[in-house]
């Protein structure tokens, strides 16, 4: 029988490359430390060395914040990186940072209570769906702060967290991995190609959800490069390195817990948390500032960059193994990500193949775990939540079809990310 | 999709041995999957084992186990088959395949012409 | 191991007829599921692959179809060159197990 090793990563500042990733060091208290370059090394070693800059040939070079290096003004990119005041813009009406508004049509299923409540946060909009109160008076006036309509005399409405509010971005606001819910039934209708397998995996532009569907679905944001250079996001006024997680403070909402953020790169992902429908014990507690109930007195067993209690659980969520196999010729790439289950004892194989940044194949099969076991080519390289696989399949059913009509370099890697379960910020779930 | 190049018909003694060779070209043999399998006339396939050829690695059904060796040439892109102890119940055709780009699932896409192998005193 | 009870046996079609071979797996094998032709005296060759994917360079008017433990491959339109012996196999589980075959002759 085949040992799956795990593959050889780096570990620096809890957090995981692979072999070959290069990145800046984020250093307190400077932030990001351009002059210097990071090199996972093959045996697991990071490798850190100043950048050495060239010398410029003109009389004034200018220093720019993302580069190390000065240069010469006729070398520097387009105007339009320069960083310009965090204002939002939506429906052709520019917002200010902090400043609230009401957006008409975002949700389908909007109920007649409920109204579009949208925020600009750092050159992001954040919009969600608001339950307004019954109101007992003839004529009720609108007021600044809300998209509810309030008696006079009212005071400002909190927002009401209800299970099916969802955080989303406009439809109208590029976002390159905005991964939507693809409605795939189980039985698939496995066509040539494969991609038939998802026939609701719906076009960025108005795929809209109402509150039932809300599920699974990754509310990419992007922060707008004019806005913030470097690998670093920016929200509500704090500033996070790649990799680092919190939960988003928006001003109209408060810290919302059941949605967590992620920075990649420069772009926040955020995603709403689902809670397990079972624990690992008898009497989950509620415990204020965390959005699923816990178990009381569960130590987690920290493994690196992930946490795990001794029965494979994540956040009270069972965990299973995750494989991967890359394979090159002849300038394709083949890569395959496989989730190995208990019941049944099977593994889900995904099939990616990628000539010059086009798909040129992509198909899901399940394999017997007995077969799998004598693949030898496969690697252990995490373990995932059922929710997190989830999110893993409804975004590979959007980028199986935007990739297979134009170029995708770091799609499938992005998404494959959302895998790896990051160790729990604070205890944070 | 490649070709496969099986040797020539065996006649072989109860008892004795039987090396099969199968010459691969048109894929790249050291990420291959080569399967063996048996056919007696007029009857279904049967699948023996198979072989990583990246690795050397071999899995066999439990039926053959003991039975069949397989082992690689990655120079000459050759995949072999012994057969050992055999009797007459040993006598088929013996095909080599190799599975479908792509997948894991073992689907026989390219196959030899096959080796016909006769146990007979 | 899995097994695959093949039906028909044999059958004999008029060209242009419409053949349907069905078979049945005993436990689910998840679209895991291969058709293979085999002319006399000739290697098998992939038909149908992941129960319904066509392999490269076969007619179209070969289709395959099924779920769980129940799977059927459909001829439309019989030609002469189709007279062979068709084996159904699956691929979910070691060992891959084949059905016993149906021989396919015209009539």
């Known amino acids: 029988e085949q040992v799956k090793h795990s593959e050889t990563y780096c570990m620096f500042q809890d957090k995981k490359y692979r072999v070959g990733e290069r990145w800046h060091p984020y250093l307190e208290p400077y932030g990001l430390v351009y002059c210097v370059n990071c090199i996972c090394s093959e045996n697991g070693n990071v490798l850190c060395s100043r950048v050495r800059c060239p010398n410029v040939h003109c009389l004034s070079p200018v220093h720019i914040p993302h580069l190390c290096c000065p240069r010469c003004p006729d070398s520097l990119p387009p105007v339009n990186n320069k960083v310009t005041s965090k204002s939002c813009e939506y429906n052709g009406t520019t917002y200010q940072h902090g400043e609230l508004f009401v957006a008409e049509g975002l949700f389908q299923n909007r109920q007649p209570n409920q109204c579009t409540q949208c925020s600009c946060s750092e050159g992001n909009v954040y919009c969600g769906l608001k339950t307004c109160p019954k109101l007992t008076c003839a004529f009720p006036v609108s007021v600044p702060d809300s998209c509810c309509r309030v008696c006079r005399g009212d005071g400002e409405l909190s927002w009401e967290h209800s299970d099916g509010d969802i955080f989303r971005q406009p439809a109208n606001r590029e976002a390159r991995h905005s991964y939507h819910r693809s409605h795939y039934d189980p039985p698939p209708s496995r066509q040539a190609g494969g991609l038939s397998r998802f026939p609701g995996a719906r076009s960025h532009r108005g795929a809209l959800m109402d509150s039932q569907q809300a599920s699974g679905t990754i509310v990419q944001i992007v922060i707008n490069n004019k806005h913030k250079h470097g690998q670093v996001c920016v929200s509500n006024g704090k500033t996070y390195s790649h990799g680092e997680s919190w939960h988003p403070n928006l001003r109209a909402f408060g810290i919302v817990e059941c949605v967590l953020c992620t920075c990649n790169v420069t772009k926040q992902e955020c995603k709403k948390i689902h809670c397990p429908n079972r624990y690992p014990c008898k009497y989950p507690q509620k415990i204020d500032g965390k959005c699923c109930k816990v178990c009381p007195g569960k130590k987690a067993k920290e493994l690196p960059g992930q946490s795990f209690d001794n029965k494979g659980y994540f956040c009270g969520e069972e965990t299973m193994p995750v494989y991967e196999s890359v394979f090159m010729e002849d300038g394709e790439t083949t890569r395959k990500i496989a989730l190995e289950t208990e019941r049944p004892p099977q593994v889900e194989v995904h099939v990616w193949t990628i000539r010059k940044g086009i798909l040129q194949h992509f198909h899901i099969e399940k394999i017997s775990k007995r077969m799998f076991e004598e693949l030898p080519h496969f690697k252990l390289v995490t373990r995932t939540t059922l929710s997190q696989w989830k999110i893993f399949t409804e975004g590979e059913a959007q980028i199986s079809q935007m990739c297979s009509s134009r170029v995708c370099r770091t799609e499938l890697e992005d998404l494959v990310k959302v895998l790896y379960l990051e160790r729990s910020e604070k205890g944070h779930c | 999709q490649g070709q496969m190049q099986q040797s020539g018909p065996e006649l072989v003694k109860p008892g004795a041995s039987v090396k099969l060779s199968c010459k691969t070209s048109?894929?790249?043999?050291?990420?291959?999957?080569i399967s063996w399998l048996k056919q007696k006339p007029g009857q279904s396939l049967e699948w023996i084992a198979w072989?990583?050829?990246?690795?050397?690695?071999?899995t066999f059904n439990q039926k053959f186990t003991g039975k069949a060796q397989l082992t690689v040439d990655t120079t000459s892109s050759t995949a072999y088959m012994q057969f050992s102890s055999l009797t007459t119940e040993d006598s088929a055709i013996y095909y080599c395949?190799?599975?479908?780009?792509?997948?894991?699932?073992?689907?026989?896409?390219?196959w030899g012409a096959g080796t016909t192998v006769t146990v007979s005193s | 191991d899995i097994q695959m009870t093949q039906s028909p046996a044999s059958l004999a079609a008029s060209v242009g007829e419409t053949v349907t071979i069905t078979c049945r797996a005993s436990?689910?094998?998840?679209?895991?599921l291969a058709w293979y032709q085999q002319k006399q005296g000739k290697s098998p060759q992939l038909l149908i692959y992941?129960?319904?994917s066509l392999e490269d360079g076969v007619p179209s008017r070969f289709s395959g179809s099924g779920s769980g433990t129940q799977y059927s491959m459909k001829i439309n339109s019989m030609q002469p060159e189709d007279s062979a012996t068709y084996f159904c196999?699956?691929?979910?589980?070691?060992?891959?197990?084949f059905g016993s075959g149906t021989k396919l002759e015209i009539k």
């Open positions: 395949a190799r599975k479908r780009a792509y997948y894991e699932g073992l689907y026989f896409a390219v």
């Open positions: 048109g894929f790249t043999f050291s990420s291959s999957y």
């Open positions: 072989i990583y050829a990246g690795t050397g690695a071999s």
């Open positions: 436990e689910n094998i998840y679209y895991s």
């Open positions: 992941n129960a319904n």
């Open positions: 196999k699956q691929a979910y589980d070691l060992p891959p197990t």
